[in-house]
Structure formats: C-alpha cells, structure tokens
C-alpha cells in the first residue's frame, strides 16, 4: 500500500516537473522573444527624398523618390513615391514665352512640397534633366536653349529644396541611366541569391536586361553585348557597379522619337505630293488635318527633306493602311550604308542583340493603349492587330475611345507601326526574339525611365564595389541567437534530468 502510494506520488511529481519545465520553457521563450524583438525594434526610419524632373520633348514629369538613409548603398531600396505630370508641352516650346515657365512648374513643385515632410525640404536634392527636345533646340541655337534653362533654374531655385541644377543630358547618359534604372529595380545588381522573386520578369540569373527607351524626339537602345570588344568606341560604356564590371553598348537616335519620326515622314512624303493633299496610310480612313509647312520645317529633324513647296499648308487625309504605312516608315531608316560588321540604321554600329529587353516610356504607353503588352502576344499577332486597328474608320475610333484626346488618338496607328518598324527593321529583332521584349511601365511601383538612374548616380548611391554587409540583418541575427539559445537551454535541462535521475524521470512513463 505504502509502495503504491509512493509510486503514485513519484508519478505525480515527475509529470508535474515535466509540465512545469514545459510551461517555464514556453514562458522563457516568450520572454526572450519579447526582449529580443523589443530590443531590436527599428528606430523611427531616417528617410531621405530626391526629386528629378524629366524635361522631355513633349512634356515634363516630376518624380519623387525615397529611401532609408542607413541603406543608401543597398540595392533596390530607392523607390518612387510620386509622379506629377506638368500641364503643358515640353520646355523647349517655351522659347517664345519664357516668362510662363515659372507658372508651368508651380503645380508639380507644390505637390512635391506637400509629399515631402517639411523637415526634409532643405536636404532634398532637385535635379532637372532635359533630353532630346532641348538637344534639338540647342542645335538650332545655344542662346535659346540657355535662355530656357536659365529661367527654369531661376524658377526651381525659388523652392525650399536643395536645387542641384538643370542641364541637357547627352543621349548616351539617357540610354545608360535608363539601363541602370531597370536593372536596379529588377534586382540585377544584387549579388545575393534570392530564395524567391517578387519582381516581375525576374529570372534568378544575374543577366542584365537591355533597355529600349522611346521618347518624342529620340530613342535609345542599351544592352550588354556578348562580345566585349566594340567596333565603335563612341557607343561603348564601362561601368563598375556593386563590384561587377559591365561593358555596355548604347546609342541614342536623335530625331527618331515618335513625334520627330512623324515630322520626318510627313516632310519626306510631301516632297512627292502632287498638290496640297497628302493621302497618308498612317492615319485612319476619314481623318483630316491641316499642317503648316513652316511647322514642318521648324525642326532640324526634317532638314534633309526641306524643299521649297508651292503652298504654305497641306492637308493630311488618312487612308489607314498598315502595310503602306510600314513601307513609308522604313524609308526613314537608311540601311544601305554600314561601315561596321553590323549596323542598326544610318550607319550606326549595333552589335548582335543579347538577352531580354525592357521596352519602356512610349514603347510601353503606345503598346499598352493598343493592348499589345502581353508576354503571350507574338510579333505576328501584333502585326495583325495593327493592320486591323489602322484600317478602322476615324469616326469609329473616336467613338470607341471617346475619353482620349484626338491629337494623341489620331497618332496611335503611326506610333504602333513605327514601333514595330523600329524594333524589327531598325534594331533587327525577329519574330523569335520578339518574346525577349518586355513592355514595362512600372517595376515595383517605380516608372521605368532614365530619372531614377540619374538620381542614383548623382547622389552616389550606386557603389562601384559591393558594400560589405553581414549575411543577416541585426534583428534576424538576434532573433535566431535567442531562439537557438533557448533550444540549447531546454535541451541542456532535459539532458541533465535524464542523466542525473534517469530511473526516476522515466518511472511510469513507459
């Protein structure tokens, strides 16, 4: 009886000891986790901001970027928080009304004032980069380009931000910064291998994407070719980013943006028109528009087609024929002369295409409008859809897209045809390599374009060498240390109990 009582007590005790051990272990885990997490709770983040104005040929856009200050050199930490499109045309159109530039920029600069905390205003850098529209104005007159930029600078200096200047960026820079932007956002510069991918288009390899940028006045192609040696040093760039060397090919085709390409085509076609009516296959049937000859010859892009015409105006009459439009567009590309092993057009060196390409800016806007950005749409299907779209009567088009400004709406047939011609005949993409072109608007909420790359460069946020960093963040490290410490403590306690009183511990538990 006594023996039974004693064994019951022992059983009760051993069970209770186990329960107490378990309970206290859980409490300890919770306590240690709480302490660990509280201890490592991030301090209020020190956020930095940057503003870049993209002064394009057709309009100006303001971009606001933000990033955690302590992670400045990390890859992929900068992201866009705001885009503000300035109402009105590009700054180059303000030559005759420079006094209006201040008002022109007001809305978007005020928006920046609202978005960025007041305490950050004075240390927020503002950069304005002007592209091909201003390059063309400078080509006509350095004085006029300077005057526009001077007024822009004076206007931007009136805001509480840290204004860093307005300048005309080169075509090479435009191409290079676009390439940096998309690869930065796609995580291509990160040397860490990722277990999973949250970025669209991202393959787990670190092969960079090529960049295809289309603006109103120029177009850029930038990529890392397979062959590291280049036949044309003017098109070669060397970068060292995050500890890796990149030999990049880039070229900017001035006058081959969609708007200037259209002016070129009109100037070329009017040369052979028998009267002041231009029957144009690149506009929908039934479309009519009067063009001033003086406007046609205003741009340096039409200089080669300039001639004395017996009329001051002519009328475009749309006939909507994709095939004829395509043929007319091809005449803008001189492929008869190439002083290199391979050229794009107009005697410009182009190495064999390599890898995937991100096509952004107007490449994306136009193709997105035409609903042709899907990865699943083949080049043949795109051509078919373009044929169908261009042949639709203008009245029908206006009804179908009632919310779209007629000026833009009327030009989608030309722009779509031009994009196909440029990619296929200009850059030598094929029906097979078409699938390597990804039409991209945004990557993780940031617009694809040159502005982010420009800011990253000017703020020295892309280090040449890979920053020295621990494999784990501090908080993860502490958390794992606590967890493993607990496991070890518990295992040690149980181990001690087992080894010191094995018979007592296991009694009645079998």
């Amino acid at each position: 009886m006594e023996d039974t009582k004693e064994s019951n007590v022992k059983t009760f005790c051993s069970k209770n000891i186990l329960a107490i051990l378990g309970f206290s272990s859980i409490i300890a885990v919770i306590a240690l986790l709480a302490v660990g997490l509280t201890q490592n709770k991030a301090l209020p983040e020190n956020i930095k901001y940057g503003i870049v104005l993209d002064a394009g040929s057709s309009h100006t856009s303001l971009y606001i970027y933000k990033w955690p200050a302590e992670k400045e050199n990390d890859t992929g930490v900068v992201h866009q928080v705001e885009e503000c499109r300035v109402k009105g045309p590009g700054i180059s159109k303000y030559v005759q009304k420079v006094n209006e530039i201040g008002i022109y920029l007001t809305d978007c600069m005020e928006r920046a004032r609202e978005v960025i905390p007041r305490s950050q205003h004075q240390e927020t850098p503002v950069y304005l980069g002007a592209t091909a529209g201003m390059r063309l104005l400078r080509m006509e007159s350095e004085e006029l380009a300077d005057r526009v930029l001077d007024v822009v600078e004076r206007s931007l200096s009136n805001y509480p931000f840290d204004f860093q200047g307005a300048r005309i960026i080169t075509g090479q820079e435009e191409g290079a910064y676009g390439w940096i932007t998309i690869n930065y956002l796609l995580g291509k510069f990160s040397q860490k291998t990722r277990w999973f991918s949250i970025v669209p288009y991202e393959t787990n390899n670190q092969e960079t994407f090529g960049a295809l940028d289309l603006g109103g006045a120029s177009t850029q192609i930038t990529f890392v070719p397979q062959n590291q040696t280049t036949e044309s040093p003017d098109n070669a760039l060397q970068f060292r980013l995050y500890g890796k060397d990149y030999n990049v090919y880039t070229h900017s085709f001035l006058c081959y943006g969609k708007d200037q390409a259209l002016w070129q085509k009109l100037a070329k076609d009017i040369q052979v028109a028998s009267n002041e009516i231009l029957r144009d296959p690149c506009f929908h049937p039934g479309y009519k528009k009067v063009v001033n000859v003086s406007d046609l010859y205003k741009t340096p892009c039409t200089k080669r087609f300039e001639m004395t015409l017996p009329f001051q105006q002519f009328e475009i009459q749309g006939i909507g024929n994709y095939q004829q439009c395509h043929q007319s567009v091809l005449e803008l590309f001189n492929t008869s002369y190439c002083p290199y092993s391979q050229c794009a057009f107009n005697g410009i060196f182009l190495p064999p295409l390599q890898g995937d390409f991100g096509a952004f800016s107007a490449f994306y806007f136009v193709m997105n409008f035409l609903n042709l950005t899907s990865e699943k749409v083949s080049q043949e299907k795109v051509t078919e859809m373009m044929k169908k779209f261009c042949s639709q009567p203008w009245e029908e088009i206006k009804t179908s897209y009632a919310g779209v400004k007629e000026k833009y709406l009327s030009e989608y047939c030309f722009s779509g045809t031009y994009i196909l011609s440029l990619l296929l005949q200009g850059y030598h993409f094929t029906a097979d390599s078409w699938e390597h072109i990804h039409f991209i608007g945004k990557i993780q909420g940031s617009d694809a374009g040159w502005t982010l790359g420009y800011m990253l460069n000017l703020t020295n946020m892309i280090p040449a060498e890979q920053p020295l960093s621990t494999p784990l963040s501090h908080s993860t490290y502490v958390f794992l240390m606590v967890l493993f410490s607990l496991v070890l403590v518990i295992v040690a306690i149980i181990g001690l109990l087992i080894f010191h009183k094995p018979s007592y511990f296991w009694k009645d538990m079998v």
């Epitope: 400078r138 080509m139 006509e140 007159s141 005057r147 080169t170 090479q172 001035l254 200089k303």
Partner: antibody, heavy 116, light 111 residues
Framework: QVQLVQSGAEVKKPGASVKVSCKAS????????MHWVRQAPGQRLEWMGY????????TFSQKFKGRATITVDTSASTAYMELSSLRSEDTAVYYC?????????WGQGTLVTVSS | DIVMTQSPDSLAVSLGERATINCRAS??????????MYWYQQKPGQPPKLLIY???NQGSGVPDRFSGSGSGTDFTLTISSLQAEDVAVYYC?????????FGGGTKVEIK
C-alpha cells in the same frame, strides 16, 4: 575637350574643285551643326553655309549655292566642304566652326590657293 | 541680308586704357528676347576666338576686361584696360538669320 582638326593646305588650278575635311572630337558629333566660314587675305570673315550632321541637311549662303557642297561621315565624326569651279578669288583660309548660332569652337583653318 | 557695320576700322589705345568698338546691324538682331550678336577676336595666323555671345555674355576663359552691351541694332565691345596680348582684329557677327554675316573688323593696336 572639343577639337576640330582640318586637313592641310591645298593649291588648285582655276576650274578645279577642292575638298576640305574637318575632324571633330570631344563631343557627340551629331548634336551640333557644323558651319564653314572663309577669309580671303586681308578680308572680313564670310559665312558659307552649314550642315546638320545627324541627317545631312544643309543650308548655304546664296553666294555659294550650287558651287559648295557640305557632307559628313558620322562614323568618322568628320565634315567635308567641297567647292567647285574654283577661281582666283576663292583663295582664302577656310574654317569649320561648331555651333547652332554660337561659334565657340573653330578648326585651325585650311589655306586654299587658286592659281594657274 | 543683314549688313553689319563696324566702327572704327582701326583703333590705337595706350596700355591700361579703355578701348570701345561699335557695331551696327541694318535691322534688329533680337529674337525671342535674345540678341543674336557675337564678338570674336582674331590674331594673325589663328582662327577667330569667341569673346562675347548673346551681346553681353562672356565666352569661356575670356578675361573679365572684355564686356559687351547693346540690343536691337546697336552693340558695343569694351576692353576696360587694354593689355599687350589684346592686339588683334575684332569682328562682330549676327546669327539671327541666314546668311550669318560679319562686320568688316576693327584692328586694335597699342598707342
């Protein structure tokens, strides 16, 4: 830095043609127009015409229309000015100058002597 | 064509003294609020060197003693304190419209 280097001096007979070259470096060749200006001995500077290198379009002073031709080779970043049907009054130093409206950079000049 | 008339044809100034050259255009060379007027310096055997652009802006590397003024049709180049190295021929030019035209030149010498 921007540099414009011109070809050497030429001696030509009346009625012949001369072609002067101007090699540019230090900037994107197609971003700026190239002008040609000449200066006869002891005379004022005389603007002849210009070319838009990005597409080869050109404009001339009425005086030189039909007799002067300006061309470019963009792959070599070089502009050329050819003057035909030379006469003794074409003896001059021929300059290339980069610019839209501001001639900030000039070649060193090429002396063309027209003599029978 | 816009005719550019320079005066005087030649000018002798003592070292350290002010030299003033005038240029008159046959019509206004202003457009869009900019004066398309330029001044060049040319020394024997050398190409012209841009001194002043847009009527009053100094070219890069041009000493402060050179200044330009004027608008419309009347323009002036001033050398505030003549130095020995300033001996040269000075030309005005308009690029408002084609054909771009030059003045006849002013020869500056030391008195």
């Amino acid at each position: 830095q921007v540099q414009l280097v011109q070809s050497g001096a030429e001696v030509k007979k009346p009625g012949a043609s001369v072609k002067v070259s101007c090699k540019a470096s230090g900037y994107t060749f197609t971003d700026y127009n190239m002008h040609w200006v000449r200066q006869a001995p002891g005379q004022r500077l005389e603007w002849m015409g210009y070319i838009v290198p990005l597409n080869g379009g050109s404009t001339f002073s009425q005086k030189f229309k039909g007799r002067a031709t300006i061309t470019v080779d963009t792959s070599a970043s070089t502009a050329y000015m050819e003057l035909s049907s030379l006469r003794s009054e074409d003896t001059a130093v021929y300059y290339c100058a980069r610019g839209g409206t501001r001639f900030a950079y000039w070649g060193q000049g090429t002396l063309v002597t027209v003599s029978s | 064509d816009i005719v550019m008339t320079q005066s005087p044809d030649s000018l002798a100034v003592s070292l350290g003294e002010r030299a003033t050259i005038n240029c008159r255009a046959s019509e206004s060379v202003d457009n869009f609020g900019v004066s398309f007027m330029y001044w060049y310096q040319q020394k024997p055997g050398q190409p012209p060197k841009l001194l002043i652009y847009g009527a009053s802006n100094q070219g890069s590397g041009v000493p402060d003693r050179f200044s330009g003024s004027g608008s419309g049709t009347d323009f002036t180049l001033t050398i505030s304190s003549l130095q020995a190295e300033d001996v040269a021929v000075y030309y005005c030019q308009q690029t408002k419209e084609v054909p771009y035209t030059f003045g006849g030149g002013t020869k500056v010498e030391i008195k």
